[in-house]
Interface confidence: low
């Protein structure tokens, strides 16, 4: 790889390896590797291995590290509001006497006007203004499905409040689904959380523009504050560029390890504790794919002559508009290790040890 | 600020400003600022301002950007397992005939052995092995409170599975609470989600080591696979360092704007669209606090003579063990803008425009 001056790849790797030596010791707050004099011979105890494996395994419900932002996320999103169908609409008739829920209906044609194609939708939030309340209540949000079935979307514990408060629920997937289903009226339900053995299932939360018998619930105030969808979407005219050839790549192991990319990319580096660091004290694992980031992130002068060409490069080379962009880790993963302190085996998790992808920042 | 060579702060700011010019245009996919010929005079329409304000306001339930990792998170975490109290214990007697839930109890003294002080706990997960199942079910987790009340913790939609599967729930706050409450038995409940108008409230999910009438539910296998808490904590002997003088600071606006820090820090930079960029086409806001990152991140050779002193610097100056650490943005925030395309006002959200904190990476 060459930038202005040729990069000595071996020196970079050596520096990374030495940095990792210090990083591991510093994370363990050790001034030097622990003595191995008292370590019992033989394999690691089964319980320790089970613990190590528990730590290493990703399981259902554990959130992985945030994914790098997709290319479309770099670009501006047009923001629009779609108010819920007016409460005077006959569609609300059947829902009036249900004490555990309030209902909101939306016209898909209004949504489609703002977001002509489902993939253009970047984020959709349902925003509800809750009126002041002296009670705590656990509430849930559901999406109307075929016939009279409802799909659970999310929940919230609402604590007492002296002032009206806006609530926001992420309904991106739901709105994308609605857009795929053709025009019509789609519904959502805001309900009390009904527990299996609870008697009081009444919704005590009042929502501006829905809850009955509130003064000042007319005209503009009512209109501005009634539930709405806040939509963020890529405008149609901007979307066609996303399929063009000059698109932003994820600078991850999939791309970088199989390409000859000269600019910023994640580079392969396996650390063998014994060979590279001369360490025998880490019993598991024997080594790990540390990797590292390398490659130039050219600073782009926006006063360049080829202005429109230059702008297309921003997304890849200087998305954060830095004065001196730098190739740094984006997605990192932890590393669990097993080592002994005296005769006692320890399983420890070291954060941010494995570089999965890089970015210009 | 000086590194090896003196930094021309004005040049850095100028470069950042010029980079922002390109960034905004590129995010909007504009080759040049839009013409303002057809923009109607007078104020922005009320609806547009309301939309702009909706985009700008943080609301309850919207997740803010991830917080920078606290200092303690840099250091290694010791990992331990605490199995639930054995099912033969009399404490389970009352819970046997409840069809909507299964119950798990834990001994706080076992937890305290692994985590002597509540602040040392970094993460606690409740892990349950669900047996194979042909049904889909929405389930919930509750924490036992005083008397017979239960506090909701989380939920999961479980889809059919052909093989046993581990489920994980983050119970860090709950375990920290248990540690604060003195010794004793603490409980959790895994329940069917009971909706307000649903008739079938039975829990169809079977959990290894709890659900009755399963063969092979004995001895070590049973023991290894029964529900447990996976705890990650800072060891007591390592914890005392966290309160020492050389601690890692959040390189955020609170610290950096009020200090004379020479090393990597976030630096103040307000962009006035009109004055700095010569732009009149952005109607709201008039400008924004873009800020930028600047300052050296010294590479630390771990083969240094003053070894223990060097290790203490890792956390601040090279936590990612980079071969050439770089001062880059850590927490970024979006910027909503209002501008006109012809006579039509548009509200757009630009991602990652405001630098809130920096880090050496």
């Amino acid at each position: 790889l060459s930038t202005c001056k040729t990069i000595d790849m071996e020196l970079v790797k050596r520096k990374r390896i030495e940095a990792i030596r210090g990083q591991i010791l510093s994370k363990l707050r050790l001034a030097s590797p622990p003595s191995q004099g008292e370590v019992p011979p033989g394999p690691l105890p089964e319980a320790v291995l089970a613990l190590y494996n528990s730590t290493r395994d990703r399981v259902a419900g554990e959130s992985a590290d945030p994914e790098p932002e997709p290319e479309a996320d770099y670009y501006a999103k047009e923001v629009t509001r779609v108010l819920m169908v007016d409460r005077n609409n006959a569609i609300y008739e059947k829902t009036k006497d249900i004490s555990h829920s309030i209902y909101m209906f939306f016209n898909t044609s209004d949504i489609r006007e703002a977001v002509p194609e489902p993939p253009l939708l970047s984020r959709a939030e349902l925003r509800l203004q809750r009126l002041k309340s002296s009670v705590e209540q656990h509430v849930e949000l559901y999406q109307k499905y075929s016939n009279n079935s409802w799909r659970y979307l999310g929940n919230r514990l609402l604590t007492p409040t002296d002032t009206p408060e806006w609530l926001s629920f992420d309904v991106t997937g739901v709105v994308r689904q609605w857009l795929n289903q053709g025009d019509g009226i789609q519904g959502a339900r805001f309900s009390a959380h009904c527990s299996c053995d609870s008697k009081d299932n009444k919704l005590h939360v009042e929502i501006n523009g829905i809850s009955p018998k509130r003064r000042g619930d007319l005209g503009t105030i009512h209109d501005m504050n009634r539930p709405f969808l806040l939509l963020m979407a890529t405008p149609l005219e901007r979307a066609q560029h996303l399929h063009s050839s000059r698109h932003r790549r994820a600078l991850d192991t999939n791309y970088c390890f199989s390409s000859t990319e000269k600019n910023c990319c994640v580079r392969q580096l396996y650390i063998d504790f014994r060979k590279d660091l001369g360490w025998k004290w880490i019993h598991e694992p024997k080594g790990y794919h540390a990797n590292f980031c390398l490659g130039p992130c050219p600073y782009i002068w926006s006063l360049d002559t080829q202005y429109s060409k230059v702008l297309a490069l921003y997304n890849q080379h200087n998305p954060g508009a830095s004065a001196s962009p730098c190739c740094v880790p984006q997605a990192l993963e932890p590393l669990p290790i097993v080592y002994y302190v005296g005769r006692k085996p320890k399983v420890e998790q070291l954060s941010n040890m494995i570089v999965r992808s890089c970015k210009c920042s | 600020l000086s590194t090896c060579k003196t930094i021309d702060m004005e040049l850095v700011k100028r470069k950042r400003i010029e980079a922002i010019r390109g960034q905004i245009l590129s995010k909007l996919r504009l080759a040049s600022p839009p013409s303002q010929g057809e923009v109607p005079p007078g104020p922005l329409p009320e609806a547009v301002l309301a939309l702009y304000n909706s985009t700008r306001d943080r609301v309850a339930g919207e997740s803010a950007d991830p917080e920078p990792e606290p200092e303690a998170d840099y250091y290694a975490k010791e990992v331990t397992r605490v199995l639930m109290v054995d099912r033969n214990n009399a404490i389970y007697e009352k819970t046997k005939d409840i069809s909507h839930s299964i119950y798990m109890f834990f001994n706080t003294s076992d937890i305290r052995e692994a985590v002597p002080e509540p602040p040392l706990l970094s993460r606690a997960e409740l892990r349950l092995q669900r047996l194979k199942s042909s049904v889909e079910q929405h389930v919930e987790l509750y924490q036992k409170y005083s008397n017979n009340s239960w506090r909701y913790l989380g939920n999961r939609l479980l889809t059919p599975t052909d093989t046993p599967e581990w489920l994980s729930f983050d119970v860090t706050g709950v375990v920290r609470q248990w540690l604060n409450q003195g010794d004793g038995i603490q409980g959790a409940r895994f329940s069917a989600h009971c909706s307000c108008d649903s008739k079938d409230n039975k829990l169809h999910v079977e959990i290894n080591g709890i659900s009755p009438k399963r063969r092979g539910d004995l001895g070590t296998i049973h023991d290894m696979n029964r529900p447990f808490l996976l705890l990650m904590a800072t060891p007591l002997e390592r914890a005392q360092h966290l309160h020492s003088s050389r601690h890692r600071r959040a390189l955020d606006t609170n610290y950096c704007f009020s200090s004379t820090e020479k090393n990597c820090c976030v630096r103040q930079l307000y962009i006035d669209f009109r004055k700095d960029l010569g732009w009149k086409w952005i109607h709201e806001p008039k400008g924004y606090h873009a800020n930028f990152c600047l300052g050296p991140c010294p590479y630390i050779w771990s083969l240094d003579t003053q070894y223990s002193k060097v290790l203490a610097l890792y956390n601040q100056h090279n936590p990612g063990a980079s071969a050439s650490p770089c001062c880059v943005p850590q927490a970024l925030e979006p910027l909503p803008i209002v501008y006109y395309v012809g006579r039509k006002p548009k509200v757009e959200q630009l991602s990652n425009m405001i630098v809130r904190s920096c880090k050496c990476s």
Partner: antibody, heavy 120, light 112 residues
């Protein structure tokens, strides 16, 4: 306390010129858009012109476009209306008024007015 | 003719409720632009009563309230008092005119 005080009105012949001033105090003048509004004898209010906070944007009613020029001196906290080519239908009380918030076109403070009479 | 239409005069007795209306179009009131109501007592400068269609300006008694629906704006005065006798003007930005801002023709309110 917010105060707006107009001056410079008087009697002028058709085709003549006048320069009205409006001295502002009690608020940060450079943060607000300001307007001139007039009221002919026995008639309703009529918007005349507007200047933005920084003095960059100026807007005029069709009836005065090309004849009136609005300006401001933020250093002196003063607003001006240069009126040329005056006609008898320009006879009115002229008020200066400040925006409630920057360029909201809602006038939360008004001057007491200055009388302009165009007559031969 | 004014772009915003108001009745030229109205009257009411003390203690009564009166509603003054202002009719516009989609390029002004219906377009969501800021709508204001002003009171002009005889021989004085106008005073802001209501801004943004339904917000009372500071110092304005709560007998005065504003509302808006579609192209129609209303000013309601409850418990009418003698000192409420004045001219009332609505005003709004209009996007269809090069003039920019428009006032209604004004309503002369007489307290009987």
């Amino acid at each position: 306390e917010v105060q707006l005080v107009e001056s410079g009105g008087g009697l002028v012949q058709p085709g003549g010129s006048l320069r009205l001033s409006c001295a502002a105090s009690g608020f940060t003048f450079s943060n607000y858009g300001v307007h001139w509004v007039r009221q002919a004898p026995g008639k309703g209010l009529e918007w005349v012109s507007h200047i933005s906070a920084a003095g960059i944007s100026r807007y005029y009613a069709d009836a005065v476009k090309g004849r009136f020029t609005m300006s401001r001196d933020n250093g002196k906290n003063t607003l001006y209306l240069q009126m040329n080519g005056l006609k008898s239908e320009d006879t009115a009380v002229y008020y200066c008024a400040k925006d409630r918030i920057r360029s909201s076109y809602e006038y939360d403070s008004w001057g007491q007015g200055t009388q302009v009479t165009v007559s031969s | 003719l004014p772009v915003l239409t108001q009745l030229s005069s109205m009257s009411g007795s003390p203690g009564q409720t009166v509603t003054i209306t202002c009719t516009g179009s989609s390029s002004n009131i219906g377009g969501g632009y800021y709508l204001s109501w002003y009171q002009q007592l005889p021989g004085t400068a106008p005073k802001l009563l209501i801004y943004n269609a339904n917000n009372r300006a500071s110092g304005v008694p709560n007998r005065f309230s504003g509302s808006k629906s579609g192209n129609l704006a209303s000013l309601t005065i409850t418990g009418l008092q003698a000192e409420d006798e004045a001219d009332y003007y609505c005003g709004c930005y209009d996007s269809s005119l090069s003039t920019g801002y428009v006032f209604g023709g004004g309503t002369k309110l007489t307290v009987l």
